[in-house]
């Protein structure tokens, strides 16, 4: 059955109740330098209206402190008013090392990430840090990567593995789940000239992914106790027609295509999931498709196999899928793929339809073909117009945070948490944010803030308290943190 | 060595065709665009278009659509560009060069430059 | 078509001093945190080289004299400090959307 009635149950302490934010830009200096700058000045008010420095006078400064970056006062305000837990958002590679390489580290823009990990740990609210987060504008890559082939080129792997590094070198006693790429099976929308391209792109992330992964593992680890993994877009498919064959075959089709394409290298066998590697061949063999999965190596199997530390999955709705043979040697031909618009379903203004089932059928679906794996939801939301009652956004958090409670309490499915995307709106863009783009809130706030403070959907007479030790342990392993390195 | 290797000068009557080549080595020529230049003596650079040799897709500037053809033979690693209705005013040098379609799409590699003089 | 405007038309350099090159666009060639404009050099009866790329990167084996900056639509080229062999044609190109098109060239002269 599609939907369920809604169950009454809560999550367990230790969910994480989180917000996801895209790529902050760091700001290049502190905005508050009134309190750095040791002269006296007296203004002339009357005359020239300007200031003019009074000298032999030094008076006391005080530390330069990370709220005097604006940006970083703005977004623990917005934080403080979600009452989340986690706070998951991603650094800028291309600000932290302008050349690509180790050569050029920008050390302003690592203080300023610090600052907002070290502010938020004040409040209660632990990072979960993204290392790189392209999106379907913007590539994200240093310059001089973008002009050597970007992830075409199998060094691009190498130079991400050395600024992960560096990350978990200055954040990772701060930071203790890490995101390395960010939907990386979405960069064939970017990389979509032919299969072989996208296909291309999608070895060299995935090489990179376990480098960076290995590092950590190996050097990082054993003082830093994280866990690091990578975000996949996991879409749920269903089969348009529910009463023909050949649309089933499709929705599972596009679970390979989409999830399987990078979780099974990752999760499993350090190879292409077989089915999808089958389906291009067959294409190839017929003289539908030039596209070919690249042949991995043994050492290349070794390296992918077993890179994760749990399943993180960005969903936002569910596809009607039907099967349609395409021409053409690019990713989205090589699939076979028609996707259906449901006008009967309730969809926001960019078409993302609301099937709140859908999440429920994908985490059953990870655990049957992955194992009984944490599984934390990294961003899952919908754009809505509203600027104030955005009731969709409520409505969609409600009907899908109890689909994820269904598959917790009667799946047994281990989800650690959810992260709402997204915390603040850009301008121009489809309307995603709690917070309007000139940080208005909106009133889904509270709808969440409820959820969260009642740890889900209890029964009346249930408690939303948790042991108190349990409460406390992550704010005093903040302030010890805060108080070692500030 | 990346460089392109184009063909040598060629001398042609007014109203006929050329076809002149670009032979690329020491990269997978598949993967990047063959961008075609003009320049006249002593003035400036106009692009002409690009061809992708991937799939032989093609991209004009609207002044070059009627006038260059552009092709490229994957077994030889070698675009073609030809020009027709050749005038007096096409007595110019034409360049190739590669650019990253995906990346900067500036143009790293440069052939030598090919001489066409059109002349009765 | 985005129009490029370089300035000036020539100039005239002694050895060991700055050299400043212009390059205005008609409208923003800046997209996606990327700057899409690029320097090229070029010697008679050779092809033109490029020297920087994305507006502000240097182009491997190009000597660190050569530098670039700029966002949007105003661009400039500097050379410091400038030594003979840097006689030559520069041109800016842009590469922000179809046509290509590149600026008219500024001719360097070393006294």
């Known amino acids: 059955k599609e939907s369920t009635p809604d169950v009454q149950g809560q999550f367990p302490c230790d969910f994480s109740w989180g917000v996801t934010e895209s790529v902050l830009k760091p700001e290049s200096v502190a905005s508050s330098p009134q309190f750095s700058d040791p002269h006296l000045y007296v203004w002339n008010a009357t005359g020239n209206r300007l200031l003019h420095r009074v000298e032999g006078v030094r008076l006391k400064t005080r530390p330069a402190q990370c709220t005097d970056f604006v940006n970083i006062k703005k977004q623990l305000e917005m934080l403080a008013r979600m009452k989340v837990t986690h706070y998951r958002f991603a650094l800028d590679w291309a600000s932290v090392l302008p050349t690509g390489n180790l050569s050029a580290v920008n050390r302003q823009a690592l203080r300023y990430y610090r600052c907002v990990v070290s502010e938020g740990l004040k409040l209660g609210i632990s990072a979960m840090v993204t290392l790189y987060y392209p999106t379907h504008a913007h590539l994200g890559l240093p310059e001089p990567l973008l002009h050597a082939d970007g992830w075409l080129n199998p060094s691009t792997a190498e130079a991400f593995q050395a600024y992960a590094g560096l990350c978990f070198q200055e954040l990772g006693d701060l930071v203790k789940l890490w995101i390395t790429i960010n939907e990386p099976n979405r960069l064939s929308d970017i990389y979509n000239r032919s299969g072989n391209d996208t296909y291309g792109a999608a070895h060299n992330l995935l090489v990179a992914h376990a480098l960076a992964w290995r590092l950590y593992d190996r050097q990082f680890r054993p003082s830093q106790r994280g866990a690091v993994s990578l975000s996949l877009h996991a879409d749920w498919a269903e089969p348009a027609n529910p009463y023909a064959d050949s649309h089933w075959r499709a929705a599972e089709r596009f679970l390979q295509f989409e999830i399987a394409w990078f979780a099974e290298p990752l999760f499993k066998t350090g190879d292409y999931p077989a089915a999808m590697r089958e389906y291009i061949a067959s294409k190839h063999r017929r003289g539908l498709s030039s596209s070919a999965l690249p042949r991995l190596t043994e050492a290349e199997r070794r390296l992918l196999k077993g890179t994760v530390d749990f399943c993180a999955l960005n969903h936002f709705t569910t596809r009607f899928v039907m099967h349609e043979q395409l021409a053409g040697s690019r990713y989205d031909s090589d699939r076979d793929i028609q996707f259906l618009q449901d006008i009967t379903r309730l969809s926001s203004p960019t078409r993302l339809a609301v099937i709140p089932w859908g999440v429920r059928k994908l985490l059953r679906w990870v655990r049957r073909n992955y194992g009984d794996m944490d599984i934390y939801i990294t961003a899952s939301g919908i754009d809505d117009q509203a600027l104030e009652d955005d009731r969709l956004r409520k409505y969609y958090l409600g009907k899908y945070l109890q689909e994820v409670l269904k598959a917790y309490l009667i799946d047994k499915v281990r989800i650690k948490g959810y992260y709402a995307f997204k915390l603040a709106e850009e301008k121009s863009k489809p309307r995603f944010g709690f917070f309007t783009s000139d940080f208005k809130a909106k009133s889904s706030i509270q709808f969440y803030n409820k959820v969260i403070s009642s740890r889900g959907f209890p029964f009346e007479n249930s408690s939303s308290r948790c042991s108190q030790t349990q409460e406390n342990t992550e704010c005093t392993v903040c302030l010890f943190l805060v108080q070692k390195k500030p | 060595q990346v460089q392109p290797q184009e063909s040598g000068p060629e001398l042609v009557k007014p109203g006929a065709l050329v076809k002149i080549s670009c032979k690329a080595s020491g990269y997978t020529f598949t993967r990047y665009d063959i961008n075609w230049m003009k320049q006249r003596p002593g003035q400036g650079l106009e692009w002409i278009g690009w061809?992708?040799?991937?799939?032989?897709?093609?991209k004009f500037n609207e002044n070059f659509k009627d006038k260059a053809t552009l092709t490229a033979d994957k077994s030889s690693s070698t675009a073609y560009m030809q020009l027709s209705s050749l005038t007096s005013e096409n007595s110019t040098v034409y360049f190739c060069?590669?650019?990253?379609?995906?990346?900067?799409?500036?143009?790293?590699?440069w052939g030598q430059g090919t001489l066409v003089t059109v002349s009765a | 078509d985005i129009v490029l405007t370089q300035s000036p038309a020539s100039l005239a350099v002694s050895l060991g001093q700055r050299a400043t090159i212009s390059c205005r666009a008609s409208?923003?060639?800046?997209?996606?945190?990327?700057?899409?404009m690029h320097w090229y050099q070029q010697k008679p009866g050779q092809p033109p080289k490029l020297l920087i790329y994305?507006?502000?990167n240097l182009e491997s084996g190009v000597p660190a004299r050569f530098s670039g900056s700029g966002s949007g639509t105003d661009f400039t080229l500097n050379i410091h400090p400038v030594e003979e062999e840097d006689a030559a044609t520069y041109y800016c190109q842009h590469s922000r959307e179809l046509p290509y098109t590149f600026g008219g060239g500024t001719k360097l002269e070393i006294k």
């Open positions: 409208k923003s060639v800046s997209t996606s945190g990327y700057s899409y």
């Open positions: 994305l507006a502000s």
């Open positions: 060069a590669r650019s990253d379609y995906y990346g900067s799409r500036s143009f790293t590699y």
């Open positions: 061809i992708y040799p991937g799939d032989s897709s093609t």
